[in-house]
């Protein structure tokens, strides 16, 4: 009886504490709309516990449902900046493997300078998330204005 | 063998269910940009399970990575209100201890009336979070328009 | 001694993995401001693990504190669309049982085309969440632009 009970306990390592919070490193070359991210305690308050960075893109290491969140602020931006350079759009998606490519989250700036959102989505080990900023405006690299993260929520 | 398995189980109290959701109490005097928060079931749907309020500011009681989220709506606001009084900015940060002071999350209203965002960040026991609303606009006190919360995510 | 320790372990089923992420199915008839949602793997990346849909509205199956999040984007929208048709407001609330009816989260579009926010709130088994979009603008049905979800956080 006690053995049956012990079986349904949740071992610590299966809890899936996978979590990451990244800061902007740089934008891509002109024809590459991707944002390139960096993370780690040496950089400030960013970190990766489980997921990894692959050439600035976030790669998932554990299957599960994740909360994905992002905030991007445009650099030296006023309420007219974004409207002058419309359309400026941010999309978060799975970019590899190609067979699983899909847009998960999309927002346009319109007359604002910041977009922020979050969603729950299933991700699989090996999925790489890309964040594409279309348009000609530079994002802010301030760590309190632009960030991207994931949190494992359940199997 | 069974003892080793039991050791890696996660005791309930170590799960770190720390969580809080606060509603706006009042703004500070003119030279104090901080928002003052309140929480508790007597006030409606706000609550504190773990963190505490210290003179209207949220104090963390457990080390870990937290999801911090906030929404602030400006009172009696139209699409031109924020632009009349530009700049109006909200910043969430650690304000004490002074040695750990840092801005975690920052958004400007520009031509909008509401900002909402969230991020993952490491917080330590004793960290006090302040929410600074710079500018001269009153925030809404409606509990579905202005709120601030944290959720412990992992050690 | 070991038995006492085993008692405070957390059984898997009590972890309350309840979670749902929904995509927009359709809007209601003219006098019904509610958005009608759908979810399930056959539809793409939406899912329900615990909560259920009741005529397009989300019904909670487990008491606890939940993170509720939403993003709604207006269809074929530019920065002037929302301002032409002001006010367009989204509210998420408990709509049944009537005794627990309350607005949990409210945002207006003003000059923007997307609203996105999240909050922690206590919900009880049987609570039905409704998302009311007031105004005359159609929301986008793109699954990366409009979505609604909940995540159980703690008892």
């Amino acid at each position: 009886q006690r053995f049956a009970q012990a079986q349904q306990q949740l071992p610590l390592e299966s809890l899936g504490w996978d979590v990451a919070e990244l800061q902007l490193n740089h934008t891509g070359p002109q024809q590459d709309p991707r944002l390139y991210w960096q993370g780690g305690p040496a950089l400030g308050r960013s970190f990766l516990h489980g997921p990894e960075l692959d050439k600035g893109q976030l790669r998932i290491h554990r299957d599960g449902i994740y909360m994905v969140h992002i905030q991007v602020t445009l650099a030296i931006c006023s309420s007219t900046t974004a409207s002058r350079h419309h359309p400026t759009t941010l999309a978060v998606g799975i970019c590899s493997p190609a067979s699983r490519s899909i847009s998960l989250l999309r927002l346009s700036f319109h007359q604002g300078c910041t977009i922020a959102s979050q969603r729950l989505t299933p991700l699989a080990r090996g999925d790489t998330l890309c964040t594409n900023l279309t348009g000609t405006l530079l994002p802010s690299r301030n760590t309190d204005e632009t960030f991207f993260g994931v949190q494992w929520v359940r199997p | 063998q069974r003892f080793a398995q039991a050791q890696q189980q996660l005791p309930l109290e170590s799960l770190g269910w720390d969580v809080a959701e606060l509603q706006l109490n009042h703004t500070g005097p003119q030279q104090d940009p901080r928002l003052y928060w309140q929480g508790g079931p007597a006030l409606g749907r706000s609550f504190l399970h773990g963190p505490e309020l210290d003179k209207g500011q949220l104090r963390i009681h457990r080390d870990g990575i937290y999801m911090v989220h906030i929404q602030v709506t400006l009172a009696i606001c139209s699409s031109t209100t924020a632009s009349r009084h530009h700049p109006t900015t909200l910043a969430v940060g650690i304000c004490s201890p002074a040695s750990r002071s840092i801005s975690l999350l920052r958004l400007s209203f520009h031509q909008g009336c509401t900002i909402a965002s969230q991020r993952l960040t490491p917080l330590a026991r004793g960290d006090t979070l302040c929410t600074n609303l710079t500018g001269t606009l009153l925030p809404s006190r409606n509990t579905d328009e202005t709120f601030f919360g944290v959720q412990w995510v992992r050690p | 001694q070991r038995f006492a320790q085993a008692q405070q372990q957390l059984p898997l089923e009590s972890l309350g993995w309840d979670v749902a992420e929904l995509q927009l199915n359709h809007t209601g008839p003219q006098q019904d401001p509610r958005l009608y949602w759908q979810g399930g793997p056959a539809l793409g990346r939406s899912f329900l693990h615990g909560p259920e849909l009741d005529k397009g509205q989300l019904r909670i199956h487990r008491d606890g504190i939940y993170m509720v999040h939403i993003q709604v984007t207006l269809a074929i929208c530019s920065s002037t669309t929302a301002s032409r048709h002001h006010p367009t407001t989204l509210a998420v609330g408990i709509c049944s049982p009537a005794s627990r009816s309350i607005s949990l989260l409210r945002l207006s579009f003003h000059q923007g085309c997307t609203i996105a926010s999240q909050r922690l709130t206590p919900l009880a088994r049987g609570d039905t969440l409704c998302t009311n979009l007031t105004g005359t603008l159609l929301p986008s049905r793109n699954t990366d632009e409009t979505f609604f979800g909940v995540q159980w956080v703690r008892p």
């Epitope: - | 706006l24 003119q30 709506t73 400006l74 009172a75 009696i76 606001c77 031109t80 209100t81 632009s83 009349r84 009084h85 530009h86 500018g135 001269t136 606009l137 009153l138 809404s140 006190r141 409606n142 509990t143 328009e145 202005t146 | -």
Partner: antibody, heavy 120, light 111 residues
Framework: QVQLKQSGPGLVQPSQSLSITCTVS????????VHWVRQSPGKGLEWLGV???????DYNAPFISRLSITKDNSKSQVFFKMNSLQADDTAIYYC??????????????WGQGTSVTVSS | DIVLTQSPASLAVSLGQRATISCRAN??????????MHWYQQKPGQPPKLLIY???NLASGVPARFSGSGSGTDFTLNIHPVEGEDAATYYC?????????FGAGTKLELK
Amino acid sequence: QVQLKQSGPGLVQPSQSLSITCTVSGFSLTTYGVHWVRQSPGKGLEWLGVIWSAGITDYNAPFISRLSITKDNSKSQVFFKMNSLQADDTAIYYCARNDYYGNLYAMDYWGQGTSVTVSS
Amino acid sequence: DIVLTQSPASLAVSLGQRATISCRANKSVSASGYTFMHWYQQKPGQPPKLLIYLVSNLASGVPARFSGSGSGTDFTLNIHPVEGEDAATYYCQHSREFPLTFGAGTKLELK
């Protein structure tokens, strides 16, 4: 200390325009808005319009076509101009500072007032 | 436009007694968790002076004998105990929306 001092003519011919300058001290026009209010025996206190810190204006609808409020932040001056005055525009005209909170729309300091008579 | 109706138009009160002035709005002046009603005092030959903002908050330098109350559409200004310097006309003002409007005023005289 906070002060608003008004200067302008006391007598205006019918169909002519009224110009009043409000010079402020003790606060900055880049932080505070300035309202204009008039007071007449027949209509009591009547809000006319406001210029905000960002230079944006809001006017009371009946006056929108003949009222202009501008400012010069560097000189701490707000300029009020109303066109096509008639006899029923006879009143005391006040400038008043908007309360610190820009969306509270209360007026916490007032000018001394400019008494204006519209008559030929 | 929101119309504010003050009553009485005038009242006479003895020194040390209570003066009560009412202001009624034709629709709610509450929004965003606040109630946007303010009170002013005006003495002859002077501009109005802000007394109370957001129903019940005393403006800087206003004595504690002034108090405001009310909600929704019905509001009250109380002065107790009335002093000689309180002889003036009192106005309510809403700021729920544009245009801002004022009540017609209540003249307080001393018996």
